[in-house]
């Protein structure tokens, strides 16, 4: 289960949001929810343009 990069962190460093891969962090509800509830970008066919580049950390953001 991917929970984001792990590293040694300073005491004041931000912690990653621990959402499982099928979930995204709801910034307003302040907890993880199904990504489909948040209008996160749908996967597109290869070659299709997307509205904004998405990183591998998508569910955590």
């Amino acid at each position: 289960m991917r929970r984001g990069p792990r590293s040694l962190r300073g005491r004041d460093a931000p912690a990653p949001t621990p959402c499982v891969p099928a979930e995204c962090f709801d910034l307003l509800a302040r907890h993880c929810v199904a990504c489909g509830l948040l209008r996160t970008p749908r996967p597109k066919p290869a070659g299709a343009s997307s509205p904004a580049p998405r990183t591998a950390l998508q569910p955590q953001e």
């Epitope: 912690a15 995204c24 307003l28 509830l37 209008r39």
Partner: antibody
């Protein structure tokens, strides 16, 4: 493509209720956060509130208890009501959808100018 | 609420010039998840606002590379390297870190000198 369109009266009398509809096509309002934002003459943008995928709402405290946002999922529309309007509520009203990954307003209606005047 | 202070309010430029708009927030916009949710919008005359830059420095799809965003914490800048006629309008910064409510800068009107 997701498209939003505001509709409602362009002229409202002081003390009356401003009522606007936002019609959404290309996406379901049972997903995401759906918002009302207004722009005053002179360019100030004010965030008014949202209705969420679950139907929960948030209202900007600056609007006190004058505001209500509701929805009709069968029509894929959400609504703004602003009670007891004054001339200070004259503005262009926008509905907008929120990107749920980077949290910007990714889709906006064209806006509707509402003038409060007797 | 987070106050977003934008300067200048009006920015007269000549076509081809560089333009720079500043946005300062009343608190750090670094979220506890490490992201900085500072965005820039452009509202052209007669249109609704459109996203230009998201998360400080990422250009939205279709936005020309003459637009760039930078900054961190509480101080952010939008630069247009060579202003074109189609760039005229009102630019707004906005924060989505400490929400709700979402808050906007007061707007900078880019106009021809």
């Amino acid at each position: 493509d997701v498209q939003l369109q505001e509709s409602g009266p362009s002229l409202v009398k002081p003390s009356q209720t401003l009522s606007l509809t936002c019609s959404v096509t290309g996406d379901s309002i049972t997903s995401g956060y759906w918002n009302w934002i207004r722009k005053f003459p002179g360019n100030k943008l004010e965030y008014m509130g949202y209705i969420s995928y679950s139907g929960s709402t948030y209202y900007n405290p600056s609007l006190k208890s004058r505001i209500s946002i509701t929805r009709d999922t069968s029509k894929n529309q959400f609504y703004l009501q602003l009670l007891s309007v004054t001339t200070e509520d004259t503005a262009t009203y926008y509905c907008a959808g929120l990107d749920g990954l980077y949290w910007y307003f990714d889709v906006w209606g064209a806006g509707t100018l509402v003038t409060v005047s007797s | 609420d987070i106050v977003m202070t934008q300067t200048p309010l009006s920015l007269p430029v000549s076509l081809g010039d560089q333009a720079s708009i500043s946005c300062r927030s009343s608190q750090s916009l670094v979220h506890s998840n490490g992201n900085t949710y500072l965005h820039w919008y452009l509202q052209k005359p007669g249109q609704s606002p459109k996203l230009l830059i998201y998360k400080v420095s990422n250009r939205f799809s279709g936005v020309p590379d003459r637009f760039s965003g930078s900054g961190s914490g509480t101080d952010f800048t939008l630069k247009i390297s060579r202003v074109e006629a189609e760039d005229l309008g009102v630019y707004f910064c906005s924060q989505s870190t400490h929400v709700p409510p979402f808050t906007f800068g007061s707007g900078t009107k880019l106009e021809i000198k």
